[in-house]
Amino acid sequence: MSSKYPRSVRRCLPLWALTLEAALILLFYFFTHYDASLEDQKGLVASYQVGQDLTVMAAIGLGFLTSSFRRHSWSSVAFNLFMLALGVQWAILLDGFLSQFPSGKVVITLFSIRLATMSALSVLISVDAVLGKVNLAQLVVMVLVEVTALGNLRMVISNIFNTDYHMNMMHIYVFAAYFGLSVAWCLPKPLPEGTEDKDQTATIPSLSAMLGALFLWMFWPSFNSALLRSPIERKNAVFNTYYAVAVSVVTAISGSSLAHPQGKISKTYVHSAVLAGGVAVGTSCHLIPSPWLAMVLGLVAGLISVGGAKYLPGCCNRVLGIPHSSIMGYNFSLLGLLGEIIYIVLLVLDTVGAGNGMIGFQVLLSIGELSLAIVIALMSGLLTGLLLNLKIWKAPHEAKYFDDQVFWKFPHLAVGF
């Protein structure tokens, strides 16, 4: 029997998405214009390459990383692209309204596209915890709420704590992780009998998830350096991120083997642990003075990631209903916290060096900043979860979780696609 897209959603989704798109087009028409001052076309191309790297990370990297489910690989990739496309549009407008609107129109630059892509990336990290249990109409809601929450968080942190673009965007890891986990906590958890196989990984989708991990691995240095102000900072960030992710790959593969009784390597561990170093050094990637420190961080991050992948899924599956293969949420939450702690250590060293006796105050500010990111993530995540539970979205029935056939037209209606 072909499982059609439920009739009510067929009415709801196109109307909802196209109305929203029309509203965005109108907002762009009335409130935005391009930066007309680009003199240097070579510089433009070089600057665009960073944005291109971020788009590749988002569309291919995170798109494929979440595609390891046996029966939900198409939806994972395509829904990610849908969310990225919608998220970038809304993020450009929101960032413009929050930062430059008083002066009149929002000026769209390559930098604003870069910021918007990174904001949309947050949704793609969060959604890993709920993909397969929600439909596109629900994902639209998630995109709008999360991008809005992150944009406001960044503005508040920038104004209150005086952080720069890089620092306030690096809260994305903990923000996205806790947002996703809190949304997952609100959604119906148990998988009914007979659907357990759908959240298992299969060889071909797992290979595409590994491809996603490789793309993320290659472009993570671009992500960590994208918002830095000077060439020296960008250079440091690229080098340190590269060393950290290189070591976390070695640690992930060997640690995964070590964690298995027969010394076998787990695909799931490797998918996420290869990125561990990049997340852990994110906040302080431009400040780490030598390669060996970045490498040690990569090692620690890889071990934490593998340890987390071994011991946390049981708990996450029970409490949050997150499948074993969707480990990005708790992975990023742990590694994001590690990154923030490293920055706090640097802050303490800096304050001690300055000899001004304000260590407690500076640490308190940093902890306040991190706490604010977590609190806003949890609150907005819970709000989103509650919104997604509303009947109007016609959420897929639990029996239809992790099933591409609910959303896609397969002419042959084969089961083992």
């Epitope: 930066d35 680009l38 240097d40 510089g43 433009l44 070089a46 600057s47 960073v50 630059t109 390559l110 930098f111 870069r114 920038s158 005086n162 952080t163 720069d164 673009y165 102000r229 000077s230 060439p231 020296i232 900072e233 440091n236 302080s284 431009h286 400040l287 003075p289 920055y343 640097l346 802050l347 060293l349 800096d350 304050t351 060096g353 300055a354 304000m358 105050f361 500076q362």
Partner: antibody, heavy 125, light 106 residues
Framework: QVKLLESGGGVVQPGRSLRLSCIAS????????MHWVRQAPGKGLEWVAG????????NYADSVKGRFTISRDNSKNTLYLQLNSLRDEDTAVYYC??????????????????WGKGTTVTVSP | VMTQSPSSLSASVGDRVTITCRAS??????LNWYQQKPGKAPKLLIY???TLQSGVPSRFSGSGSGAVFTLTIASLQPEDFATYYC??????????FGQGTRLETK
């Protein structure tokens, strides 16, 4: 020798436009963020605008937002400031300055280490 | 907001001179000092609150952290009579200068 040379200043009526240029010599412009700073007659220094080394990000003082536009052409080693809708209070000497970054333990330090001689803009009816 | 004190100061050659700069909130050590002579462009003296820019005489020194900073000239020389500005680089992405301190001969 590292130098910055501004040009394009002059006398202009309120509401009109002007374009200032700053040519860098002795160093490669594309490696540095750049700024415009102005000084009204008998007054202190006021930061006007800044642009990142790759031109991707631009920031402006509230007093000029929406009227002034900073840009750069790294291939020509030149920084620009487009002044539109000029007002009397925009009368000043405009300096371009190079930004340098130095690594601190928990944050980079930024400072302006090279300044041009300045170009005078007079807004007068 | 950066507030410099005093706004003007008279001193003699050989004197020890101190200029203070106060920030409205903590800017850690992200403060720079500039010297400007009449009709000339500003010149960087100190960055990061206390690091002397190369080529600047060692009689100039900077100290402070948080919200209160000082520029000290250990022994005033004739060429040091000028206007001095502090500038913070912590409030990203904006930059703020102090109103200036005019140092003149007594």
């Amino acid at each position: 020798q590292v130098k910055l040379l501004e040009s394009g200043g002059g006398v202009v009526q309120p509401g009109r436009s002007l374009r200032l240029s700053c040519i860098a010599s002795g160093f490669t412009l594309r490696n540095y963020a750049m700024h415009w700073v102005r000084q009204a007659p008998g007054k202190g220094l006021e930061w006007v605008a800044g642009i990142w080394f790759d031109g991707s990000n631009k920031n402006y003082a509230d007093s000029v937002k929406g009227r002034f536009t900073i840009s750069r052409d790294n291939s020509k080693n030149t920084l620009y400031l487009q002044l539109n809708s000029l007002r009397d209070e925009d009368t000043a000497v405009y300096y371009c300055a190079r930004e340098r970054a130095a690594r601190g333990i928990s944050r980079f330090y930024y400072y302006m280490d090279v300044w041009g001689k300045g170009t005078t803009v007079t807004v007068s009816p | 907001v950066m507030t410099q004190s005093p706004s003007s100061l008279s001193a003699s050659v050989g004197d020890r001179v101190t200029i203070t700069c106060r920030a409205s909130q903590s800017i850690r050590s992200h403060l720079n000092w500039y010297q400007q002579k009449p009709g000339k462009a500003p010149k960087l003296l100190i960055y990061g609150a206390s690091t002397l820019q190369s080529g600047v005489p060692s009689r100039f020194s900077g100290s402070g952290s948080g919200a209160v900073f000082t520029l000290t000239i250990a022994s005033l020389q004739p060429e040091d009579f000028a206007t001095y500005y502090c500038q913070e680089s912590y409030s990203n992405p904006l930059i703020t200068f102090g109103q200036g301190t005019r140092l003149e001969t007594k």
